[in-house]
Every structure is written in structure tokens, then in C-alpha cells.
């Protein structure tokens, strides 16, 4: 085609195009102040405005902050690019129990199959380990390498209380046990594995920084660029990302060039009062008994674990809504129904059981 073999550097004398020797073709010259979206733009739509660092240009042409993967339980899956947010996922050995835009709000450890059970499906970043009864003749303790990892005394084998089949009654009770040490506690103190990918220090494919002399005449090396810690929102406005600096908050998704940072309550807490991209008030989360086991669920991003033991054992424990997701900090419909005084009593030893309503919200059960 003629465009593939232009006259030397002239592009047939068309001033709106230039010849790129690297790709050996004529490219559209973005107007001054705009930034090319590809190496050799072909049309005006291939030009954009420039956002601030850690911001991306969203579908509405607004600079929005990229999410960050700075939480210890997250790793960067894809970097912050000029037109897409950074994407985070749970680090190896953990799965996402509560998803979030471009990230995961809550990661939990993969379950360790207990004695008598073997791994049916290994855990992924999205799904928990699925266990099944061991076949006769197979050593129940070491039916698979993962089963040989025995949890330390006093801990629960699951990463979190696991979902149950939809309850037939409006509420099921669960005793609150004081001697239980939550795996969430341990998770919150863990540091990222040395060989795990990390967003720290790794430049994205396009952080929004331009070459030495941005926007020279005719180069079009520009796009709307918001300041760092700001994102280009849906209306095209540079908007400040929320801060997760409060002690009871952790970063759920980072500040990206086209999406705000989002915060959630730290492990062991649940959002009682939601706020945009954050939580205004976090309260302690109900604790489940160490012996609790549940039935498998065949849904993505759910805590799908092993089958329950025979009848007559501990009652099911399910502090999450029936869909299996933990309450999201930004969802006003999934807040605790206990008052602040009652919420303070939940994590400590008590004889008062906590009931779960049909919506999965914990309420005090007078007994």
C-alpha cells in the first residue's frame, strides 16, 4: 500500500502526518498538547490528554487514580497504564473473599484440608481450596502435600469462617468463643513473600510521565494529567483519592490515574457506617468457633471448603451474607446491626450467642 512505502520522510507532503522509521509507515501527528495512545497513531482518536502520576484516563476521558497493591496480602497483576487501572490480586497462598474494582477487598488464606480430606481443587487467587473425603486406603493426613501442613494448635484450619448453604431458618446461632485466634490476625501481620511480585518500585507501562520535552510542536506527546494522588473521575475531573490513614482502615485498592483509592476496615473488623470509597466507622468482627466446618459451594470467589462432619457436631458459623461474600466496607446495606456497646463485646469470651439474620447480618441473640 502507498502508506507503507511513503516518499522518504514526507508522507506525500501531508503536514498532519510524519514518517516513523521504526515502523516504516506514516503516522498521524497528534495536535500539540495531546499524547499519542500508540507508537504510530493513525487518526485523531489515537491522541489523548495526559493525567498525573498513578492516574489513568477512564472511559469518560477523566483522569482517575489507579488502585494500589500496597497491602501485604496483595500483589500487582497488571500495572497502571495510561488507559487502565492497576489490577491487584491476592498474593500466593490466599484467595479473594470480597472482590473490589480492580482489586480485592479481603483476602484470606487457602484452607488446609483436615484429616480425612484431600484437595479436590487447589486454591487460586480467586477461589479457596476445595476439599473432598480421602479415598479408602489413602493416608488421610498426607493425601496431598498441602494436607501435610498442619495448622498450629489453637488456630482454625480455614482462612475465615466459611459460607454455608442458604439457611432454612431466618437465623442460625453461633457461640462466640474467646480462645479462638483468628487467621485474619496472622494475615494482617504477614509481609509479602520475597519472591512475590510487588507493585513497589515497579514502573507501570505508562505512569503518565512524558519524555524530556513534553508536547513540543507537532509531537502531540501530551494528555490531561492529574496530580499524584488524584484520579480522573467519570466526569473528567481530577479528584483527590481518599486516604486510608486511620488505624482501623487498610487500603483495598490503590489510587490510580482513573480510579480512587478505596479503603476497608482492617482484618477483624467490619464496616458499621459506610462512606464513599471508605468506611466511616469500623467495629470488631464476630468470631467463629475453631471447630466450624462448612459445605462446599461452587461459586467463584467464595470460600469453598470441605464438607461438614456428621450431624451432632458444632453448628454452622457464617458471619457473612448468604452469597458468601464478607460485607463490603462501602456497602451501606451490609453493616452491623449491633450498637457500639454490643459490638465491643463480640470478640471476647461470652456466653451470649450471636445470631445471623437471613441477610447475614450479625445481631445479638437474647437466647
Amino acid at each position: 500500500f502507498p502508506q507503507d512505502r511513503p516518499f522518504e520522510d514526507t508522507c506525500h507532503g501531508n503536514p498532519s502526518h510524519y514518517y516513523d522509521k521504526a515502523v516504516r509507515r506514516c503516522c498521524y501527528r497528534c495536535p500539540m498538547g495531546l499524547f499519542p495512545t500508540q507508537q504510530c497513531p493513525q487518526r485523531p482518536t489515537d491522541c489523548r490528554k495526559q493525567c498525573e502520576p498513578d492516574y489513568y484516563l477512564d472511559e469518560a476521558d477523566r483522569c482517575t487514580a489507579c488502585v494500589t497493591c500496597s497491602r501485604d496480602d496483595l500483589v500487582e497483576k497488571t500495572p497502571c497504564a495510561w488507559n487502565s487501572s492497576r489490577v491487584c490480586e491476592c498474593r500466593p497462598g490466599m484467595f479473594c473473599s470480597t472482590s473490589a474494582v480492580n482489586s480485592c477487598a479481603r483476602c484470606f488464606f487457602h484452607s488446609v484440608c483436615p484429616a480425612g480430606m484431600i484437595v479436590k481443587f487447589p486454591g487460586t487467587a480467586q477461589k479457596n481450596t476445595v476439599c473432598e473425603p480421602a479415598s479408602p486406603g489413602v493416608s488421610p493426613a498426607c493425601a496431598s502435600p498441602e494436607n501435610c501442613k498442619e495448622p498450629s494448635s489453637g488456630t482454625i484450619p480455614q482462612a475465615k469462617p466459611t459460607p454455608v448453604s442458604p439457611a432454612t431458618s431466618s437465623a442460625s446461632t453461633m457461640p462466640v468463643r474467646g480462645g479462638t485466634r483468628l487467621a485474619q490476625e496472622a494475615a494482617s501481620k504477614l509481609t509479602r513473600a520475597p519472591d512475590s511480585p510487588s507493585s513497589v518500585g515497579r514502573p507501570s507501562s505508562d505512569p503518565g510521565l512524558s519524555p524530556t520535552q513534553p508536547c513540543p510542536e507537532g509531537s502531540g506527546d501530551c494528555r490531561k494529567q492529574c496530580e499524584p494522588d488524584y484520579y480522573l473521575d467519570e466526569a473528567g475531573r481530577c479528584t483527590a483519592c481518599v486516604s486510608c490513614s486511620r488505624d482501623d482502615l487498610v487500603e483495598k485498592t490503590p489510587c490510580a490515574w482513573n480510579s480512587s483509592r478505596t479503603c476497608e476496615c482492617r482484618p477483624g473488623m467490619i464496616c458499621a457506617t459506610s462512606a464513599t470509597n471508605s468506611c466511616a466507622r469500623c467495629v470488631p468482627y464476630p468470631i467463629c468457633a475453631a471447630e466450624t466446618v462448612t459445605k462446599p459451594q461452587d461459586m467463584a470467589e467464595k470460600d469453598t471448603t470441605f464438607e461438614a462432619p456428621p450431624l451432632g457436631t458444632q453448628p454452622d458459623c457464617n458471619p457473612t451474607p448468604e452469597n458468601g461474600e464478607a460485607p463490603a466496607s462501602t456497602s451501606p446495606t451490609q453493616s452491623l446491626l449491633v450498637d457500639s456497646q454490643a459490638s465491643k463485646t463480640l470478640p471476647i469470651p461470652t456466653s451470649a450467642p450471636v445470631a445471623l439474620s437471613s441477610t447475614g447480618k450479625p445481631v445479638l441473640d437474647a437466647g
Epitope: E52, D54, C215, D221, K224, Q225
Partner: antibody, heavy 119, light 111 residues
Framework: EVQLVQSGAEVKKPGSSVKVSCKAS????????MNWVRQAPGQGLEWMGQ????????NYNGKFQGRVTLTADKSTSTAYMELSSLRSEDTAVYFC????????????WGQGTLVTVSS | EIVLTQSPATLSLSPGERATLSCRAS??????????MLWYQQKPGQPPKLLIY???NVESGIPARFSGSGSGTDFSLTISSLEPEDFAMYFC?????????FGGGTKVEIK
């Protein structure tokens, strides 16, 4: 040639407002953030905020939020900074400056507009 | 906001001497492998003039005797051999966080 030409000096009473203009030429006005910086007599520089003329997007220094309003007129390639509820400590030279896309530096500056607030 | 502290406040030197100006930030200015630190020169009655961007890149048209260095929180501007026209005020500026802030300035005066 890139040029930023600001309006002339102003003398204002406390409590009143002032609107300083900055006419740009020689570049694509809509595609560069326009910053506003002020400098009190014998003092340092203070960033007030910036506006993206292409769509009117703004960032403000919280210190001035509510008192400063940045606007831009694409048809005349002119940026405006209005400061209200003036007090004596607002006496300063006000600069407009174009922000480079990419490294956030301000490469071209207006000559400055002296605003004196006195009763 | 990020606080920038410049030192010394005044530097008294003679033409031909080497000048080293310091600027310390209250938190890191690192951003995707670059530091969002800028240096400006200002003479009486004039607007500031961009010298250095991204901590160490010299703006087009600025003499090679000007150089910038540093990363994280500690930065410096060096004038290898002072010329008479270099005696002026110098300001550092950060663009890492909004609001952008400037240092208090260093006055380079003739000794």
C-alpha cells in the same frame, strides 16, 4: 513563541474581590494546565491551584479553597484567577504559569500582577 | 502537605566558586522511578525561571553549569562555577502531592 500576558496591578479594599487575567498565546491553550502562584513582598512562592482549560478541571490549594476561583475562556485563550474576601496578607504578586505535561514543571510564566489590599 | 526546607538561607560566594544548595522534603518525592522535584531561579522583579525538573534534568536553554541531584527526600542544586548573572534567589518545588509546595528559598549573593 509561548507567551503569558497578565492584567495590570490592582489596589483593593479588604473584603472585596480581585480577578486577574492571563492571556496565553503560542501554544495549545486547552491542553496544558495553567497554574497560579503568588509571592508576598520579600517572601517565597505559594502555589494556589491549577486549571485545565480543555474542560475546566481544577485543583486547589486547600488554604485558598472557597476563596479562590480559577476559570478559563478557551475562545480567548485566557485564564482567570479570582480571589475573594481579600485581606491585607493577600497583598502579593500573582503569577500564572503553564505546567508541562509529563514532569509537572512550570516552564512559562506570566510577568506577574501586583495586588495590593489596603484600607 | 509536604514541607520543603531549603538550606542555607543565604549563600555568600564569589564568581567562579561552586555553589551547592540543598532542599529537603518531609516525605519522599519518588514517583515511578523519578523524583518530582523542580528548581527555579528568580531575580528581582521577574517571574521564576525553570532550571531543573525531575530532580536532575536540566531545562532546555539552561547553561550546563547548573545540575541537580538527589532522590527520595534529599536534593541539591549545584552551580559548578558561578557567573555574575547567577546571583539570585533559588526555589525548590515538589509536585508529588497536592498542594504543590515550594521551599523558602536560598539567596545566592556576591561575597
Amino acid at each position: 513563541e509561548v507567551q503569558l500576558v497578565q492584567s495590570g496591578a490592582e489596589v483593593k479594599k479588604p473584603g472585596s474581590s480581585v480577578k486577574v487575567s492571563c492571556k496565553a498565546s503560542g501554544y495549545a491553550f486547552s491542553s496544558y494546565w495553567m497554574n497560579w502562584v503568588r509571592q508576598a513582598p520579600g517572601q517565597g512562592l505559594e502555589w494556589m491551584g491549577q486549571i485545565y482549560p480543555g474542560d475546566g478541571d481544577t485543583n486547589y490549594n486547600g488554604k485558598f479553597q472557597g476563596r479562590v476561583t480559577l476559570t478559563a475562556d478557551k475562545s480567548t485563550s485566557t485564564a482567570y484567577m479570582e480571589l475573594s474576601s481579600l485581606r491585607s496578607e493577600d497583598t502579593a504578586v500573582y503569577f500564572c504559569a503553564r505546567r508541562i505535561n509529563g514532569n509537572f514543571a512550570m516552564d512559562y510564566w506570566g510577568q506577574g500582577t501586583l495586588v495590593t489590599v489596603s484600607s | 502537605e509536604i514541607v520543603l526546607t531549603q538550606s542555607p538561607a543565604t549563600l555568600s560566594l564569589s564568581p567562579g566558586e561552586r555553589a551547592t544548595l540543598s532542599c529537603r522534603a518531609s516525605e519522599s518525592l519518588e514517583y515511578y522511578g523519578t523524583s518530582l522535584m523542580l528548581w527555579y531561579q528568580q531575580k528581582p522583579g521577574q517571574p521564576p525561571k525553570l532550571l531543573i525538573y525531575s530532580a536532575s534534568n536540566v531545562e532546555s536553554g539552561i547553561p550546563a553549569r547548573f545540575s541537580g541531584s538527589g532522590s527520595g527526600t534529599d536534593f541539591s542544586l549545584t552551580i559548578s562555577s558561578l557567573e555574575p548573572e547567577d546571583f539570585a534567589m533559588y526555589f525548590c518545588q515538589q509536585r508529588r502531592k497536592v498542594p504543590s509546595t515550594f521551599g523558602g528559598g536560598t539567596k545566592v549573593e556576591i561575597k
